[in-house]
Interface confidence: low
Amino acid sequence: ETVHCDLQPVGPERGEVTYTTSQVSKGCVAQAPNAILEVHVLFLEFPTGPSQLELTLQASKQNGTWPREVLLVLSVNSSVFLHLQALGIPLHLAYNSSLVTFQEPPGVNTTELPSFPKTQILEWAAERGPITSAAELNDPQSILLRLGQAQGSLSFCMLEASQDMGRTLEWRPRTPALVRGCHLEGVAGHKEAHILRVLPGHSAGPRTVTVKVELSCAPGDLDAVLILQGPPYVSWLIDANHNMQIWTTGEYSFKIFPEKNIRGFKLPDTPQGLLGEARMLNASIVASFVELPLASIVSLHASSCGGRLQTS
């Protein structure tokens, strides 16, 4: 049966979803276990011109071999205002000084990056040492690069489309995810549904997605259900500021009782099917419906509070 609920974009003041993911448009992770220099390459695209970027490098001490030296090659297409955090890491940074401005002096060794196309930049980097990771990111707001983490099966890093960087790289896009909402026809009451659909990633290892839900309503004003649907290898850690009904695939737990896993359900994996699920749970409003790439952290902020959906 078709569910009549015309999903329309919701204004950011009614609902906003941000997320952190390891999925990249192009990337690779390789192992270079005996290399003296760990080389990472980031190609960053900023479609709207000058941007601010928070870039954090984290070192993992493996077998007491850290620190080895790190070369980070930063290729950007427009002006970037960079906050770099790389405490205690023997970092060499190669970048275009006319495009990258540091919010404070970086305190690391720097090299001017030649104005080469991507393939030549990779070759230039590879001449300095085996490339551990390379990624192409579109409009990042923050990036976390974990050093000494490379779990790749490759011995040579070659950019490939639609890659999962695993623990090596996590990033947060600047643009929040598209949030849509609708009224479920023929359902009375003020119960609202928040539906989050996480799409399958490019590697199928077990994943926990942390879902932070912040609804700006007085607790008594709210009758809500949170529907979380994802691939079978995804479990959920829920951090919510309201009590609400939970309906998920896989297993879920709450941040306040992380050790207590609760079994979820088999849920439909289509938007129509999930809208049907919301209707079956007596929701009259889908306050937010979001589809995301496989993420590690998702934050939902909404201020619908039942019965007052506004689309943009």
């Epitope: 003041e13 941000t18 011109g49 000058p50 941007s51 601010q52 928070e54 954090t56 002006s79 205002f81 906050h83 955090q85 401005t101 919010q103 404070e104 002096p105 923050s142 976390l144 912040e214 700006s216 934050s299 902020h301």
Partner: antibody
């Protein structure tokens, strides 16, 4: 809607202390870089200092004029920013604004007046 | 520290006039941000990264410049535009503001 509401201003004697608060709502406070900017009566804007986000280990930065006397802190669980002002001088008299930095100062509070006078 | 010098410090003009506010940095900066302030009110974000208007700012405003010289231009002054405008840089620590330009009705 982003809202920043300052409080805690008032009259204090030179050498005294005061703590300003800024209650934030309408955005993910823990992800935000938050600043204090002040404006002496009839004068221009002066940056006081900043505290970075959780991802940046809450790093703090200060203007030379307040370094060692002022401390910026935050409580992400309460969505609140603080400015602890010690050893106050008459030249610290100003309206203090709490602001959010996101590419630029995209949100400002209404300000709270601090008067340092004997 | 990078010093920011705004000129003129005050500007007297009529509704419909074109107004140009200049901000000169003591050394090169990556880009400039602008804020509008009316008496007794908090500053409002007005333009960022040199040429991008903040949300809700009318298109009669435009920003331009590079290096040390930046301008905020109002193509046709409207009554609500009479206010003080501040430029600001953060290409190098510490963050600094210009001294402000007061746009007054002639």
């Amino acid at each position: 809607e982003v809202q920043l509401v300052e409080s805690g201003g008032g009259l204090v004697k030179p050498g005294g202390s005061l703590r300003l608060s800024c209650a934030a709502s309408g955005f993910t406070f823990s992800d935000a870089w938050m600043d204090w900017v002040r404006q002496a009566p009839g004068k221009g804007l002066e940056w006081v200092g900043e505290i970075r986000s959780q991802a940046s280990n809450h790093a703090t930065y200060y203007a030379e004029s307040v370094k060692g006397r002022f401390t910026i802190s935050r409580d992400d669980s309460k969505n609140t920013l603080y400015l602890q002002m010690n050893s106050l001088k008459t030249e610290d008299t100003a309206v203090y604004y709490c602001t959010r930095w996101r590419r630029f100062f995209d949100s400002w509070g209404q300000g709270t007046l601090v008067t340092v006078s004997s | 520290d990078i010093q920011m010098t705004q000129s003129p410090s005050s500007l007297s003009a009529s509704v419909g006039d074109r107004a140009t506010i200049t901000c000169r940095a003591s050394s090169s900066v990556s880009y400039m941000h602008w804020y509008q302030q009316k008496p007794g009110k908090a500053p409002k974000p007005w333009a960022y990264a040199t040429s991008n208007l903040a949300s809700g700012v009318p298109s009669r405003f435009s920003g331009s410049g590079s290096g040390t010289d930046y301008t905020l231009t109002i193509s046709s002054l409207q009554p609500e535009d009479f206010a003080t405008y501040y430029c600001q840089q953060w290409s190098s620590n510490p963050l600094t503001f210009g001294g402000g330009t007061k746009v007054e009705i002639k």
